[in-house]
């Protein structure tokens, strides 16, 4: 369950949210801005050569709760943060790669950046 009185099921925003997009701009984006009914995100992950790559964009409401949940993937270093508090809020997200050692927990934190800029943990 999420903290701060949020319900577990994501609810539709009353209005469209604009996000910065980079390496992840859909066809309907304009000037590196995409639109969504869900979340803005910024993600860092290693490419095949081990170089960190930062991607940002929009996540639709459908399935975004799962995608914003930073669940560890075996043999893949990746971190994602999501936000909704204002347009282009993902400009201010700076996720960092998790440490190299194997992580021994299965369910990672939900990385939703909100007004207070703290992470919600289970």
């Amino acid at each position: 369950k999420k903290e701060d009185g949020e319900s577990t099921a994501p609810t539709a925003r009353p209005k469209v949210l604009r996000c910065k997009c980079h390496h992840h701009c859909p066809e309907d984006s304009v000037n590196n801005i995409c639109s969504t009914d869900g979340y803005c995100f910024t993600m860092i992950e290693e490419d095949d050569s081990g170089t960190p790559v930062v991607t940002s964009g929009c996540l639709g409401l459908e399935g975004s709760d799962f995608q914003c949940r930073d669940t560890p993937i075996p043999h893949q270093r990746r971190s994602i943060e999501c936000c909704t508090e204002r347009n282009e809020c993902n400009k201010d997200l700076h996720p960092t790669l998790p440490p190299l050692k194997d992580r021994d927990f299965v369910d990672g934190p939900i990385h939703h950046k909100h007004h207070h800029h703290h992470h919600h943990h289970h």
Partner: antibody, heavy 116, light 112 residues
């Protein structure tokens, strides 16, 4: 009920600027974008741009960049559109409209006449 | 910009008839979220437009069930099952998938 109140008409001289207003009531002003749309007889409807009152974020139709400036006053739940360097081409009806994912409510429109 | 092409420009009907208006877009209106942001409005003389149908087929509150919308991708239709006098005016389709948002040129529904 949702209402968007606009003055009925404005008359201005060529080369001047004008600030059109749109006062919102009946809903939480910051929960929706405000759009502006131009309508000239026989020219259909043209989207000028939109502003999100919660963070004053704007998006413009490239065609109206430099012509229109969108602003809001959240304390009075009023949106404004400033039009500059007016010519006869700017004579039209200008509507404000509430936008979430589509426009659901429109103001009655302000008829702008640019004439010397 | 996405061009919205409406046909016919004028639609003469008798009261009680069915009316059908077509709207085609120059590119797909399916948004990256999966939604299709195609909407229909009616504008009566001297008034602002009124929302009839949003997201292809959803009737806005207070809109009679004789109005229906259908379509997908680039091809959309508004149908009025039995035209009443209050339905006369200019019908516009509109898309809010791609910025800048654009409108059809309008279809004038008039009495035959």
């Amino acid at each position: 009920q949702v209402q968007l109140q606009q003055p009925g008409a404005e008359v201005v001289k060529p080369g001047a600027s004008v600030k059109l207003s749109c006062k919102a009531s009946g809903y939480t002003f910051t929960n929706y974008w405000m759009q502006w749309v131009k309508q000239r007889p026989g020219q259909g409807l043209e989207w000028i741009g939109e502003i999100d009152p919660s963070d004053r974020y704007t998006m413009y139709n490239q065609k109206f960049k430099g012509k229109a400036t969108l602003i809001v006053d959240t304390s009075s739940s009023t949106a404004y559109m400033q039009l500059s360097s007016l010519t006869s081409e700017d004579s039209a009806v200008y509507f404000c409209a509430r936008f979430g994912y589509y426009v659901d409510y429109w103001g009655q429109g302000t008829t702008l006449t640019v004439s010397s | 910009d996405v061009v919205m092409t409406q046909t016919p420009l004028s639609l003469p009907v008798s009261l009680g008839d069915q009316a059908s208006i077509s709207c085609r877009s120059s590119q797909s209106l399916v948004h990256s979220t999966g939604n299709t942001y195609l909407h229909w409005y009616l504008q009566k003389p001297g008034q602002s437009p009124n929302l009839l149908i949003y997201k292809v087929s959803n009737r806005f509150s207070g809109v009679p069930d004789r109005f229906s919308g259908s379509g997908s991708g680039t091809d959309f239709t508004l149908k009025i099952s039995r035209v009443e006098a209050e339905d006369l005016g200019v019908y516009f389709c509109s898309q809010s998938t791609h910025v800048p948002f654009t409108f059809g040129s309008g279809t004038k529904l008039e009495i035959k």
